[in-house]
């Protein structure tokens, strides 16, 4: 009889230990959840406040109307320039008008002087047509001034106030473009 009672007591004690452990685990889990919630809320508030205070363009980008422009500080071939822009959520510059061309060339003059900058223009190897990266044709006043004699792929670049063409494998600076964020305030 005594043996039976002590066995039951031991089982109860074991149960109690397990319940304490479970309670401890639950308390830990709750604390961890609370911390995660705090982190989540802080992250959300941060995101919201930075979105609220954000300027239409990222740091080191230039704004003109609905567009943001990034003028690179490194040289690369045309294809790598294209990928560098994509990494920033942008594409190589697509010049839509003379006004945009004037803004770009004016800005470049202020920033860096007379260097070569890749834009998102390339010449189709078969037809010889110039096309922007999205497949659209440049307006007649925005065609590269000289036809490159290169047998390789030919791409467009800006220098001073001109749009010129060159072998896509040459190294130049580049200009990326993305839409400016609309202010909701």
């Amino acid at each position: 009889k005594l043996l039976q009672v002590s066995t039951i007591a031991m089982q109860q004690q074991e149960k109690l230990i397990q319940q304490e452990r479970a309670l401890l685990n639950f308390t830990e889990w709750k604390r961890s959840c609370a911390l995660q919630m705090k982190y989540c809320q802080a992250f959300m508030q941060n995101s919201l406040s930075s979105a609220h205070n954000s300027s239409p363009c990222p740091n080191n980008w230039i704004q003109n109307r609905e567009s943001c422009y990034y003028v690179s500080e490194i040289w690369s071939i045309w294809h790598t320039s294209q990928e560098n822009c994509l990494k920033e959520g942008s594409t190589l510059l697509q010049i839509e008008s003379k006004e945009e061309m004037d803004f770009i060339t004016g800005s470049l003059r202020k920033i860096k002087g007379s260097y070569d900058y890749w834009v998102g223009l390339s010449q189709d190897g078969h037809s010889g047509r110039w096309l922007w990266q999205d497949g659209s044709s440049p307006s007649p006043g925005l065609l590269p001034a000289e036809r490159s004699q290169s047998a390789n792929q030919v791409c467009g670049y800006v220098k001073s106030n001109s749009l010129l063409s060159s072998n896509c494998s040459t190294w130049k600076y580049f200009i990326c473009e993305k839409y400016a964020l609309r202010s909701s305030v």
């Epitope: 994509l86 990494k87 920033e88 959520g89 594409t91 999205d134 993305k178």
Partner: nanobody, 115 residues
Framework: QVQLQESGGGLVQPGGSLRLSCAAS????????MGWYRQAPGKQRELVAA???????TYADSVKGRFTISRDNAGNTVYLQMNSLRPEDTAVYYC?????????WGQGTQVTVSS
């Protein structure tokens, strides 16, 4: 990490169409653009088309007017609609996620254009 899963490849006749899909999961908030590359046997991997998270597309000269890249509204899935396919479009097509840091690649899907 960003995980990418491609689908939609297959065998198609010249002049036919295919639609490739690439579904992204994981840390997709870090992705600034997504694109499709292709690699034919013995050739280098080349960018076919890409689309930024603002929806701006970019295409290789060889596919302009034939291929169209698009995204779903959530931005998690990117599609490549390929029309007027040619034998020279035969390749393994890879999806790529562009971030400021690492770039992430899918496993690839085979596209074969043959009669």
């Amino acid at each position: 990490q960003v995980q990418l899963q491609e689908s939609g490849g297959g065998l198609v006749q010249p002049g036919g169409s295919l639609r490739l899909s690439c579904a992204a999961s994981g840390r997709i908030f870090s992705v600034n653009a997504m694109g499709w590359y292709r690699q034919a046997p013995g050739k280098q991997r080349e960018l076919v088309a890409a689309i930024t998270n603002q929806g701006a597309p970019t295409y290789a000269d060889s596919v302009k007017g034939r291929f169209t890249i698009s995204r779903d509204n959530a931005g998690n899935t990117v599609y490549l609609q390929m029309n007027s396919l040619r034998p020279e479009d035969t390749a393994v097509y890879y999806c790529k996620a562009f971030t400021r840091g690492d770039d992430y690649w899918g496993q690839g899907t085979q596209v074969t254009v043959s009669s």
